[in-house]
Interface confidence: low
Amino acid sequence: RLSSKSVNAQVTDINSKGLELRKTVTTVETQNLEGLHHDGQFCHKPCPPGERKARDCTVNGDEPDCVPCQEGKEYTDKAHFSSKCRRCRLCDEGHGLEVEINCTRTQNTKCRCKPNFFCNSTVCEHCDPCTKCEHGIIKECTLTSNTKCKEEGSRSN
């Protein structure tokens, strides 16, 4: 059975701390779990969000000892079979970003534009500085749109 496409999802001791299962869950292509099937090594049960496998499983049914991701540095937001957590996103101040929500073991960092910066795309990898208006402002800069400036010579109401 070692050659069977397996995945491993062990869950048998959920009451106790819960990390065990077998054949674990086996192949689970239909379930879209990450890190499911690698080099013929399978675990029985996925590690829950916020944890990773301490080692690779070597046979169907092998218990995936799950250990926590490093708080503030790593996370996993889904159940998975990987021995790695994901790195937390960095909010690059040089690109006009700051932290909105800190990274936890189960959720990636959420970044936002720093004050006086904006970003008008759906996914913001960098924010642009808000334009400073020489002749007055029509609309203030927001997190998602630049300042609208009055043109030179336009009359104020």
């Epitope: 999802a9 990390l19 065990e20 299962l21 779990l33 169907n60």
Partner: antibody
Framework: EVQLVESGGGLVKPGGSLRLSCAAS????????MNWVRQAPGKGLEWVAR??????????YYAESVKDRFTISRDDSKNTLYLQMNSLKTEDTAVYYC??????WGQGTTLTVSS | DIVMTQSPDSLAVSLGERATISCRAS??????????MQWYQQKPGQPPKLLIY???NVESGVPDRFSGSGSGTDFTLTISSLQAEDVAVYFC?????????FGQGTKLEIK
């Protein structure tokens, strides 16, 4: 190839004791949780006991029907699983299977409890 | 404990016809999106043979006429075209929680 070979079954009187063994090969025994499952003559399957790996502190679990009478243990150096059965009852009569968490089953060993 | 209930208790199907066995769990056997449900075939004097694991994954070496489906609490084992060698008792099993629990078995015969 994964192999599980149970032994130790036999005829015992009610109240008696017996120890079953399961010799495992073909996989990394010491990292696997192991189980005993039994099947009474003409009946269904009943999970009996479970023992986890050393890294999980050899945690053990038992069916209510055998709690305080049966003890599951393992010797990782010998790749062997055990089931110590005390205070046996007629209703413990069954074929006892050794089962990995990966659902590999042995051929079973038969225990008969009868006076 | 999670109670597994199979239906029917026995089933007679003609050779080449489809056989369907159902298994219902008293509570969900999902674990983070994975249903820890197995199906076994058992013939007299033999240990159970794993057919399907994790609800729908066919064990290596098992003929592709066997398939499993379902999630949560309701599961089905299907044999698309019954062969003589499929006569046996079939069991479902959950491994989401200790104690592992099994269905009472379905006896499959040829009509």
């Amino acid at each position: 190839e994964v192999q599980l070979v149970e032994s130790g079954g036999g005829l015992v009187k009610p109240g008696g004791s017996l120890r079953l063994s399961c010799a495992a090969s073909g996989f990394t025994f010491n990292t696997n949780a192991m189980n005993w499952v039994r099947q009474a003559p003409g009946k269904g399957l009943e999970w009996v006991a479970r023992i986890r790996s050393k890294s999980n502190n050899y945690a053990t679990y038992y069916a209510e029907s055998v709690k305080d009478r049966f003890t599951i243990s393992r010797d990782d150096s010998k790749n062997t699983l055990y089931l110590q059965m005390n205070s046996l009852k007629t209703e413990d009569t069954a074929v006892y299977y050794c089962v990995t968490d990966g659902y590999y089953w042995g051929q079973g060993t038969t225990l008969t409890v009868s006076s | 404990d999670i109670v597994m209930t199979q239906s029917p208790d026995s089933l007679a199907v003609s050779l080449g016809e489809r056989a369907t066995i159902s298994c219902r769990a008293s509570e969900s056997v999902e674990y983070y999106g994975t249903s820890l449900m197995q199906w076994y075939q058992q013939k007299p004097g033999q240990p159970p043979k794993l057919l399907i694991y994790v609800a729908s994954n066919v064990e290596s070496g098992v003929p592709d006429r066997f398939s499993g489906s379902g999630s949560g609490t309701d599961f089905t084992l299907t044999i698309s075209s019954l062969q003589a060698e499929d006569v046996a008792v079939y069991f479902c099993q959950q491994s989401t929680k200790v104690p592992w629990t099994f269905g009472q078995g379905t006896k499959l015969e040829i009509k």
